[in-house]
Interface confidence: low
């Protein structure tokens, strides 16, 4: 048996994936554990093997179907269990009645591209990935721009309070290399959190025209 405090946290990507992290102080690193998902009103159930991500935490992804298939709705409740092998039997380590649309974390935005770049501004667009059609307009975004000599943590956050998959960055410095990231969050869900940040998009502003003030 393992003692110590444990935490079991899962998020639904709004389509066909539930990602889970289980942490347990004092657990043995080589313990074999799984997450079992049992929906209350579906015929399927699913299992994934928890793999170590740090000294005392494990993670896995419950793949519920094709990436863009709508496998759960708001009225679903999924019983999630952490099962760890103890000798010849499995022991229930954690259990959660999981409401998928109260625990949302979407996939990071994809397909970032520079639509138009000038000396002082840059227009960037992106796409959301594997987001439920149910959300329609009810999404918000945060974006950040990495300037030379700064870190991502220092970058001010730009908030887009609507489903707007583009941004026009202003007051940029000419002939300067920047990087840009964006993340997305549904408006719904008590425990909903931001998606991971997108892959950074690198771009360079155009040089100022010779003989002109910048």
């Amino acid at each position: 048996a393992v003692n110590g405090t444990s935490q079991f946290t899962c998020f639904y990507n709004s389509r066909a994936n539930i990602s889970c992290v289980w942490s347990q102080d004092g657990a043995l690193q080589d313990t074999s554990c799984q997450v079992h998902a049992w929906p209350d009103r579906r015929r399927w159930n699913q299992t994934c093997e928890l793999l170590p991500v740090s000294q005392a935490s494990w993670a896995c992804n419950l793949i519920l179907g094709a990436p863009d298939s709508q496998k759960l709705t708001t009225v679903d409740i999924v019983t999630l269990r952490v099962l760890c092998r103890e000798g010849v039997r499995w022991r229930v380590m954690a259990i959660q009645d999981f409401k998928p649309f109260e625990n949302l974390r979407l996939m990071a935005p994809i397909s970032l591209q520079v639509v138009h770049v000038e000396t002082h501004r840059c227009n960037i667009s992106w796409e959301i990935s594997q987001a439920s059609h149910y959300f329609e307009r009810h999404l918000e975004f945060e974006a950040r721009t990495l300037s030379p000599g700064h870190t991502w943590e220092e970058a001010p956050l730009l908030t887009l309070k609507q489903k707007q998959e583009w941004i026009c960055l202003e007051t940029l410095t000419p002939d300067t290399q920047y990087e840009f990231q964006v993340r997305v969050k549904p408006l719904q869900g008590e425990f909903t959190t931001w998606s991971p940040w997108s892959q950074p998009l690198a771009f360079r502003t155009k040089p100022a025209a010779l003989g002109k003030d910048t």
Partner: nanobody
């Protein structure tokens, strides 16, 4: 201020049909999601179904799936609940509610409520 007014309730025999209407006034109706809830005597208010702002997406409680249909007419600021094959256990006061988020089955997620319309299904 938003106002929601339900109508169409009444007494119907088991197996019969009713169509409830909910008219919204006081704000842009087309930019909101609308839910139907019901409350039977001595019970908590429960989710019946919901329709998204465009009307393309709907969701229903298991107990009414296949029997009830929600539609909306944004030009008339009205949402409808078509109830077929009614059962005595469908007897309740039916409320429409206006909420910001599509997937809201919890009454706490709704800001505005109508006063309700009574549906009685006799056996």
């Amino acid at each position: 201020e938003v106002q929601l007014v339900e109508s169409g309730g009444g007494l119907v025999q088991a197996g019969g049909s009713l169509r409830l209407s909910c008219v919204a006034s006081g704000r842009t109706f087309s930019a909101t999601n609308m839910g139907w809830f019901r409350q039977a005597p001595g019970k908590e208010r429960e989710f019946v179904g919901i329709i998204s702002e465009s009307g393309r997406n709907t969701d229903y409680a298991d107990s009414v799936k296949g029997r009830f249909t929600i539609t909306r007419d944004n030009a008339k600021s009205t949402v409808y609940l078509q109830m077929n094959n009614l059962k005595p256990e469908d007897t309740a006061v039916y409320y429409c509610a206006l909420g910001r988020d599509y997937f809201a089955t919890d009454t706490r997620q709704y800001n505005y409520w109508g006063l309700g319309t009574l549906v009685t299904v006799s056996s």
